[in-house]
């Protein structure tokens, strides 16, 4: 069964800078990746980025840079809002559309007691949806 993993990482050099890493574990080719926060895409979440393997990437504030890390994983850097701990306790969701499997989505957040530079390990998928 395909699986999606999500890691949220606070950068050691900039305490106000966060990076979301997402990956797809499974066969098939990825046609689109959507990253949202505050909930799943289309279910109360706000879109942060869309990444297409050929047509490029699209990002919305406060996303700073969305990019492919491998053919099946992406990263999204977020800029500080000026608020204290701006992205703590915030849920980030990644949705991978792949062929022929369909769409798979998982969500994660920064662990409550994260040290700078550490990230959440790839956890069991809390939200897993095949469309």
């Amino acid at each position: 069964t395909p699986e999606v993993w999500v890691q949220v990482q606070m950068e050691a050099t900039e305490l106000s800078s966060f990076t979301v890493h997402c990956g797809f574990l499974g066969p098939g080719s990825i046609s689109l990746v959507t990253v949202s926060w505050g909930g799943p895409d289309g279910a109360g979440g706000t879109k942060l980025a869309v990444l297409h393997p050929e047509l490029g990437t699209r990002q919305w504030a406060p996303a700073r840079q969305a990019r492919w890390e491998t053919q099946s994983s992406i990263s999204l850097a977020l800029e500080d809002s000026g608020a204290s701990s701006p992205f703590a306790n915030t849920t980030f969701c990644c949705k991978f559309a792949s062929f022929p499997e369909g769409s798979w989505e998982s969500c994660g957040s920064l662990p409550p007691s994260s040290d700078p530079g550490l990230s959440a390990p790839p956890t069991p998928v809390p939200i897993l949806r095949a469309d």
Epitope: W37, H52, G56, Q59, W60
Partner: antibody, heavy 123, light 111 residues
Framework: EVQLQQSGAELAKPGASVKLSCTVS????????IHWVKQRPEQGLEWIGG????????VSASKFQDKATITADTSSSTAYMQLSSLTSGDTAVYYC????????????????WGQGTSVTVSS | DIVLTQSPASLAVSLGQRATISCRAS??????????MHWYQQKPGQPPKLLIY???NLESGVPARFSGSGSGTDFTLNIHPVEEEDAATYYC?????????FGGGTKLEIK
């Protein structure tokens, strides 16, 4: 200079369809979303939907999903919206608008608007 | 859908005074310090014009007498000092989730 030029006024009969156009200049249509907004006479604004011309993704409000079809032709820098099965409730001014973009980041707000296309549905 | 309620529906303000327009959302439109609320001005026969984006950011070319504030569910647009050319209808719009919705509008008259 950023501009969105919309097609002219339409007079249509109930049950008919119309296709509105929005031709952009002063920026690359692939760099941002183009949205469509409805404004009935003396009333407020309603978001219909939008399109990402680079990727071809469309998003729309559920109440307009069977009413409006949004497309784009990047070669002519034009976005289109087709309204089908017209009724008197579709009589309105329809605006296209560009989503605000800066340094490759979008902001979910609409910073440049077309002049509007008036659609009148009458038998 | 998130409902935006603007108040007052209309107001009359003397030249040079402050105009305050409120917008209340039926649920929070903020996440971690980011507020997905925007303000527009519309004059008769013209399309809307973006004034403020993300609650408090002044759009390029908009006079500094316009300012936005708020977070969560309560937002405010302030105009001070009000000028004759500010007579218009003002709309708030959220983009916290799909579909984005607009407030009902506030008509500002200059006395």
């Amino acid at each position: 200079e950023v501009q969105l030029q919309q097609s002219g006024a339409e007079l249509a009969k109930p049950g008919a369809s119309v296709k509105l156009s929005c031709t952009v200049s002063g920026f690359n249509i692939k760099d941002t979303y183009i949205h469509w907004v409805k404004q009935r006479p003396e009333q407020g604004l309603e978001w219909i939907g939008g399109i990402d011309p680079a990727i071809g993704n469309t998003v729309s409000a559920s109440k307009f999903q069977d009413k409006a079809t949004i497309t784009a032709d990047t070669s002519s820098s034009t976005a289109y919206m087709q309204l089908s099965s017209l009724t008197s409730g579709d009589t309105a001014v329809y605006y296209c608008a560009r989503e605000r973009v800066h340094s490759n980041t979008l902001y979910y707000a609409m910073d440049y608007w077309g002049q509007g296309t008036s659609v009148t549905v009458s038998s | 859908d998130i409902v935006l309620t603007q108040s007052p529906a209309s107001l009359a303000v003397s030249l040079g005074q402050r105009a305050t327009i409120s917008c209340r959302a039926s649920k929070s439109v903020s996440i971690s310090g980011y507020s997905y609320m925007h303000w527009y001005q519309q004059k008769p026969g013209q399309p809307p014009k973006l004034l403020i984006y993300l609650a408090s950011n002044l759009e390029s070319g908009v006079p500094a007498r316009f300012s936005g504030s708020g977070s969560g569910t309560d937002f405010t647009l302030n105009i001070h000092p009000v000028e004759e050319e500010d007579a218009a209808t003002y709309y708030c719009q959220h983009s916290r989730e799909l579909p984005p919705t607009f407030g009902g509008g506030t008509k500002l008259e200059i006395k």
